[in-house]
Amino acid sequence: PPRGRILGGREAEAHARPYMASVQLNGAHLCGGVLVAEQWVLSAAHCLEDAADGKVQVLLGAHSLSQPEPSKRLYDVLRAVPHPDSQPDTIDHDLLLLQLSEKATLGPAVRPLPWQRVDRDVAPGTLCDVAGWGIVNHAGRRPDSLQHVLLPVLDRATCNRRTHHDGAITERLMCAESNRRDSCKGDSGGPLVCGGVLEGVVTSGSRVCGNRKKPGIYTRVASYAAWIDSVLA
């Protein structure tokens, strides 16, 4: 079986995550994303920091980034809406909504994911699924096919220890364990899914991967329900 994907996960079942998006810059994978409405993909604001002069598109219905697949379609972006409070030097408010040039053609391999609206922390220890096309090992290899890993949610107090993230994890963020299994470079903007519901978005702040003392940080979508609704309206 495939080993060591994302970091420490494995290849995802093809098209089993129909909400999964690849945010692309000039035709290459840049970040993950998640389809939250027919014409909207949620990702991370920092993903577009270096994209000023490039063409941003969204790939939906994909398992392989390179191989032809009937469900794959690349959409242009009509509008990019970063959270107004996102800043280059912080991990706070690291959300981005991308409006596709047209409504996505929905089907078994392309479908929006329900997102959490109840602003309550996910219970520590809950196993959540994170998927992406980010690097898969310590060499920095990027995969062609979608990878995923199950990660237990870590309580905020532990995540905020001085030895961990030293108080940086606000109530609008959540953490997941990172001991060998972790999200990593290129997974930013992708979904953290708990019980079939989108709970978090992988932050794109720079962070060492696979180190248990540096847990993965995820933006809690429930904390931004009002902003998401206002943009999608």
Epitope: R3, G4, A28, I135, N137, H138, G140, R142, G186, S206
Partner: antibody, heavy 113, light 106 residues
Framework: EVQLQQSGAEFVKPGASVRLSCTAS????????MHWVKQRPEQGLEWIGR????????KDDPKFQGKATITADTSSNTAYLQLSSLTSEDTAVYYC??????WGQGTSVTVSS | QIVLTQSPAVMSASPGEKVAMTCSAS?????MYWYQQKPGSSPRLLIY???NLASGVPVRFSGSGSGTSYSLTISRMEAEDAATYYC?????????FGSGTKLEIK
């Protein structure tokens, strides 16, 4: 097309320092890890370490700590290897590699008085 | 620190012959990479994640193994395969190379 272009050969005196460069084209070094590898004459390969250019985090083999410093400049898409307090043991070809799948042509460093 | 031991250190094979070389780890690893290096040239990635062929590598090359025992096989030796082959593990820091196997053409 992905390419890694390394700086030219260096001839240096014992005790001196040298900085080697590796400039990438065809991809953004922030998207992966950049590695440096040493190969002494007629010897095998030695992994020196790597850098994540997006954040500057490095991981070096302990035997090169204090000897090698890896840095990167994302604005010029270039990774660097600085070697200090050079001795004859540092005479080698030094390679850069991105994610270990694309390699530079190597830079020869000769330490001699 | 994990030590990778390659064997044999030197071997020779005739064109068309099947070639196998091994890489033994001092403790269990998950990922194994294999590289080919010809004299005067940079190393070239052949195999990643134990058994996956890197881009442009002929299908006569294959990799296998698990735990502490890994191998690289060439199904039919060709003259251009004469080179030194190195293994490297990507599971546990630091990430050393093996000592190398020099493959010569008979």
């Amino acid at each position: 097309e992905v390419q890694l272009q390394q700086s030219g050969a260096e001839f240096v005196k014992p005790g001196a320092s040298v900085r080697l460069s590796c400039t990438a084209s065809g991809f953004n070094i922030k998207d992966t890890y950049m590695h440096w590898v040493k190969q002494r004459p007629e010897q095998g390969l030695e992994w020196i370490g790597r850098i994540d250019p997006a954040n500057g985090y490095t991981k070096d083999d302990p035997k090169f700590q204090g000897k090698a410093t890896i840095t990167a400049d994302t604005s010029s898409n270039t990774a660097y290897l600085q070697l200090s307090s050079l001795t004859s043991e540092d005479t080698a070809v030094y390679y850069c590699a991105s994610a270990m799948d694309y390699w530079g042509q190597g830079t020869s460093v000769t330490v001699s008085s | 620190q994990i030590v990778l031991t390659q064997s044999p250190a030197v071997m020779s094979a005739s064109p068309g012959e099947k070639v196998a070389m091994t890489c033994s780890a001092s403790s269990s690893v998950t990922y194994m990479y294999w590289y080919q290096q010809k004299p005067g040239s940079s190393p070239r990635l052949l195999i990643y994640d134990t058994s996956n062929l890197a881009s442009g590598v002929p299908v006569r090359f294959s990799g296998s193994g698990s735990g502490t025992s890994y191998s690289l096989t060439i199904s039919r030796m060709e003259a251009e395969d004469a080179a030194t082959y190195y293994c490297q593990q990507w599971s546990t820091y630091p990430f050393p190379f093996g000592s190398g196997t020099k493959l010569e053409i008979k």
